[in-house]
Structure formats: structure tokens, C-alpha cells
């Protein structure tokens, strides 16, 4: 009689993570008597995947009833496949022996490849905010995909970026892979509403790439511009001075009025107005009683924005002459806040 052959008809099998893999194996003879076992890998370090007679293999089921007389189909199914299951699987016939069963014949092996989707890309920006004209770095990470081939693109407001570096790890063979990319983005004053997008395309995604986003509102700091103006006389001996704080982001802002270098009032920006580009404007005014002053008054509007060093703008108020209009409110969209007399 012809010697038993172990036939594994599939050289390779491709399975998506989470699905069931079917590994086919048939024997050409019932002789010699002995069990079939499945292994992943070859040699002394091989891993037992299934032993039809003993052991615990909860993920493995047999395709046919191995105990039926004359059964020669030793195919198995492995459930809930993960990338860690990738490898070459061998169907091995043993001959009963003493003290241990002896390996008699092995199949040629079936390579199981696992397609695993990349995780949702996570985009992270710099730890500290940066101002317009500065270049900041964004990173994008995605993990757990297989096979290794993957495409990553960066966009800013729909426009593809070119200044980035991408690595896929590990370099050699692995059950699954990770991608890490760093993109450089130059900030502009208009970027409060901007988004940076990392897009990952992989064979498992069927043409529907995964995207991770970062809002530049979390990254950018637009410092304010200040303008101090003197308004028309409200009443005899009273002058209204305004400080226009324009085009700042984020909103966190504290304003201090100084009169000849002495703190007069401190307030926090509250009822701000938002510009179309996402930046904010705010106005503070001070009502100065000039009759209380013999000499000229230096009024300073000092602004501390988002924890940064203070910036200031000063206005010299002449008290020798009768107060007259020295400026006008050019920011019609702004509303004043906080009247205060100085005595």
C-alpha cells in the first residue's frame, strides 16, 4: 500500500482580524495508527495549535468528525483571529509509539496572513501654544495594522502638506505594525479655525481612509494689538479714554489701567466679540476726571494675554489745556465696558 501523505492544499490563507481561519488538511491513508496534530512553525520551538486527543484549545474546532471511522479530513478552524496568529501552520501525522508518539509525516504548511485594520489615527500637537509665523510639529500615530504597506497623508484645511516624516515599525517581519509621522506646520494669524488632518489608507479599509484631526485653536496664540484713544468730552472736566484690544486668541486676557505708573484698575476680558477668523476683540474704557490733576497724566493700557509677558500702550493726557477731542472710536463693532472715575 502507498505510504501515507499529508496534504495541505492551501499554500496560503488570508484572513481579516476577528474572523475565522480554515486550515485544510487531508491524509491519504489510515495507516499508521496515530493522531494528527497542528503546529505553528517548525523545529523544536514550534507551537502546538491543536491536538485531537488532549489539551485545551478553545479557539479551535474541527471541520469534520475526527473520530468517525475512515475519516481522513483533519482540517481545523481557528476563531477570532488576531495578527498574533500569523505564521505557517503544519498538519502533522504521528505514529503511536513508546514512550511517546513519533512524528511520521508533515504537510507542506499553510501560511496564515492576517489583515488587521489600523487603529484610529491620533493626532497630537505641541505642548505649548505658538504664535503666527512660527513652525510647529504635529504627530500622528496608528497601531495594530497588517500587512505593513500603508499610506499616510497630512492636510491643513484640505490642502495636502509636504513637510513631514513617517516611520513604520518594526522594520522587519512582525505580526502587526505601527506608523508614526511628524508634520511641520507654519502658523498664520488666520489659523484659529484651521484643522490639521492625518489620513491613513490601508488595504483593510476598502478605500475609506481613517482620519485623525487636531484643531489649531488648541495650538495657536494670536497676540493682541492695542490702541489707546481719547474720546470726546462727556462732561465738563471728564475725558473718556478707551483701550481697543484687537485680534487676540485665546480669550484668556487681563487688562490693567495704569495712571502715571500706578495701578488704577484690573479687569478680565468677558464680553468679547468674535471676529470671522475666530480671534476676539475687546474694549475697555476709563473715565478720567482731569480737574483732579495739576500735571499731564500718562495713561497706560497693559494687557497680559494667555499668561504671556504683558504688552502695553500709553496715552498722554494733557490737563493744562481745556480737554478736547483727541481721537475717535474706530472700532464700531465693539462695545465699551466698565466706566470708572479717577479722583
Amino acid at each position: 500500500e502507498e505510504e501515507l501523505q499529508v496534504i495541505q492544499p492551501d499554500k496560503s490563507v488570508l484572513v481579516a482580524a476577528g474572523e475565522t481561519a480554515t486550515l485544510r488538511c487531508t491524509a491519504t491513508s489510515l495507516i499508521p495508527v496515530g493522531p494528527i496534530q497542528w503546529f505553528r512553525g517548525a523545529g523544536p520551538g514550534r507551537e502546538l495549535i491543536y491536538n485531537q486527543k488532549e489539551g485545551h484549545f478553545p479557539r479551535v474546532t474541527t471541520v469534520s468528525d475526527l473520530t468517525k471511522r475512515n475519516n481522513m479530513d483533519f482540517s481545523i478552524r481557528i476563531g477570532n483571529i488576531t495578527p498574533a496568529d500569523a505564521g505557517t501552520y503544519y498538519c502533522v501525522k504521528f505514529r503511536k509509539g513508546s514512550p511517546d508518539d513519533v512524528e511520521f509525516k508533515s504537510g507542506a504548511g499553510t501560511e496564515l496572513s492576517v489583515r488587521a485594520k489600523p487603529s484610529a489615527p491620533v493626532v497630537s500637537g505641541p505642548a505649548a501654544r505658538a504664535t503666527p509665523q512660527h513652525t510647529v510639529s504635529f504627530t500622528c500615530e496608528s497601531h495594530g495594522f497588517s500587512p505593513r504597506d500603508i499610506t499616510l497623508k497630512w492636510f491643513k484645511n484640505g490642502n495636502e502638506l509636504s513637510d513631514f516624516q513617517t516611520n513604520v515599525d518594526p522594520v522587519g517581519e512582525s505580526v502587526s505594525y505601527s506608523i508614526h509621522s511628524t508634520a511641520k506646520v507654519v502658523l498664520t494669524r488666520e489659523d484659529v479655525h484651521s484643522q490639521v488632518i492625518c489620513e491613513v489608507a490601508h488595504v483593510t479599509l476598502q478605500g475609506d481612509p481613517l482620519r485623525g484631526t487636531a484643531n489649531l485653536s488648541e495650538t495657536i496664540r494670536v497676540p493682541p494689538t492695542l490702541e489707546v484713544t481719547q474720546q470726546p468730552v462727556r462732561a465738563e472736566n471728564q475725558v473718556n479714554v478707551t483701550c481697543q484690544v484687537r485680534k487676540f486668541y485665546p480669550q484668556r486676557l487681563q487688562l490693567t489701567w495704569l495712571e502715571n505708573g500706578n495701578v488704577s484698575r484690573t479687569e478680565t476680558a468677558s464680553t468679547v466679540t468674535e471676529n470671522k477668523d475666530g480671534t476676539y476683540n475687546w474694549m475697555s474704557w476709563l473715565l478720567v476726571n482731569v480737574s483732579a490733576h495739576r500735571d499731564d497724566v500718562k495713561l497706560t493700557c497693559q494687557v497680559e494675554h494667555d499668561g504671556q509677558p504683558a504688552v502695553s500702550k500709553s496715552h498722554d493726557l494733557k490737563v493744562s489745556a481745556h480737554p478736547k477731542e483727541q481721537g475717535s472710536n474706530t472700532a464700531a463693532e465693539n462695545t465699551g465696558s466698565n466706566e470708572r472715575n479717577i479722583y
Epitope: 495508527v33 523544536p44 520551538g45 514550534r46 507551537e47 502546538l48 485531537q52 486527543k53 488532549e54 489539551g55 485545551h56 475526527l66 473520530t67 503511536k96 514512550p99 511517546d100
Partner: antibody, heavy 113, light 108 residues
Framework: EVQLVQSGAEVKKPGATVKISCKAS????????MHWVQQAPGKGLEWIGR????????KYAPKFQGRVTITADTSTNTAYMELSSLRSEDTAVYYC??????WGQGTLVTVSS | EIVLTQSPATLSLSPGERATLSCSAS???????LYWYQQKPGQAPKLWIY???NLASGIPARFSGSGSGTDFTLTISSLEPEDFAVYYC?????????FGQGTKLEIK
């Protein structure tokens, strides 16, 4: 549901023979090796041997070789373990198990004169 | 035959502590053939970890198994009251199959 139900406790005199049964349900014993394990009072587990009920092939630990016989009746889905020439040190709980994963409740054998 | 030596014989710990149980083989055992069982007084052993590192069904994730060759470990990250029992390692790589002598995990 896999279940292994063993026969009741036995008291035997030294030199006697004991035969313990292990009735399986929820699976066919022909599909698996059936193992037997000894546990003396306050001691650890010791593998005695196993049978392949499909063809009655057996393997025994050297310590028990010659005194133990493991058999199986596939028609009743039952495995048996027979231990002869009993001595006091054979006093123990004997367990059957299916393919190393599922265990019977144990049978206490007391050997006493 | 392959002799399995477990250490320590007894381990006294408090709930919440980390437990490390060792199993040393006299010759190399393929990781596929190294199992751990838990046994409580008056009960049959229960399969706890199979193929060195895989938890049997229903076993909490605080348990883990590791090792290769001749040195294997069962670790419990944070002990719960129900974890106090005897743990046996077992090899079925070659006949005769053997068990370690057991490690008794007791409450301190």
C-alpha cells in the same frame, strides 16, 4: 455540558484490588485521552496514566506500572482505573480527567487493615 | 522523566499584594505543554492557565502566565480573597506526565 462522574468512596484492605469508574457525559470518550491522577492526603498531584478509548492504547507512569490497569467501555462512555496489590500509601483521592482540561469530582480510596 | 519543582512551597501574602509563583523544569518543556491548575480544599483541580500564558475561560485578568524552556511563572497582580489556594504546574510534553509539588498561597 462536559461532566465526569466518578464512583463512590472505597475502603480496601492491603493487598486487595480497587476499580474506580468515571462516567462521561456531554462528549464521546473516544474523542479524547482519559487520564487518571492520584492525590494522597495533604500531598500533591501525581499522574498515573491514560487511555485512548478509541483503540485502548495506554500509557502508565513507571511508579504505577504493573499494578495499574486503565480500561474504557465506549458503549457506556465510561473509563476505569484498577489498582492492585494495595498498600497503605495508596490511600488517596483518585481523579479522572478528560484530555487534561475537565476533571471528575474524585474518588477517595482508603487502604486500611 | 521531567521533574517540575515549584517555589516557594508556601507563599503568605495579604489581599492586594502581588504574587509570583515559580515552576522550574529539569529539562526543557515547550510552552504549549505547560499548564497550571488551581485547587481548593475538598475540590478537584481546575485548569487555570494553558499553554504557559493563556487564561482558561472565566479566569480573571489579574492572573498571568509566562516563561519558556525550563522556567515558568504564574503571577497574580493584586490578590483577591478567592485566590488563596494551591497552584500546580503540569507538563505534558513527554511521558510520564508530571506535576509540580504545588505552591500553597495562604493569607498572611
Amino acid at each position: 455540558e462536559v461532566q465526569l462522574v466518578q464512583s463512590g468512596a472505597e475502603v480496601k484492605k492491603p493487598g486487595a484490588t480497587v476499580k474506580i469508574s468515571c462516567k462521561a457525559s456531554g462528549f464521546n470518550i473516544k474523542d479524547y485521552y482519559m487520564h487518571w491522577v492520584q492525590q494522597a492526603p495533604g500531598k500533591g498531584l501525581e499522574w498515573i496514566g491514560r487511555i485512548d478509548p478509541e483503540d485502548a492504547e495506554t500509557k502508565y507512569a513507571p511508579k504505577f506500572q504493573g499494578r495499574v490497569t486503565i480500561t474504557a467501555d465506549t458503549s457506556t462512555n465510561t473509563a476505569y482505573m484498577e489498582l492492585s496489590s494495595l498498600r497503605s500509601e495508596d490511600t488517596a483521592v483518585y481523579y479522572c480527567d478528560r484530555g487534561l482540561a475537565y476533571w471528575g469530582q474524585g474518588t477517595l480510596v482508603t487502604v486500611s487493615s | 522523566e521531567i521533574v517540575l519543582t515549584q517555589s516557594p512551597a508556601t507563599l503568605s501574602l495579604s489581599p492586594g499584594e502581588r504574587a509570583t509563583l515559580s515552576c522550574s523544569a529539569s529539562s526543557s518543556v515547550s510552552s504549549s505543554y505547560l499548564y497550571w491548575y488551581q485547587q481548593k480544599p475538598g475540590q478537584a483541580p481546575k485548569l487555570w492557565i494553558y499553554s504557559t500564558s493563556n487564561l482558561a475561560s472565566g479566569i480573571p485578568a489579574r492572573f498571568s502566565g509566562s516563561g519558556s524552556g525550563t522556567d515558568f511563572t504564574l503571577t497574580i497582580s493584586s490578590l483577591e480573597p478567592e485566590d488563596f489556594a494551591v497552584y500546580y504546574c503540569h507538563q505534558w510534553s513527554s511521558y510520564p506526565y508530571t506535576f509540580g509539588q504545588g505552591t500553597k498561597l495562604e493569607i498572611k
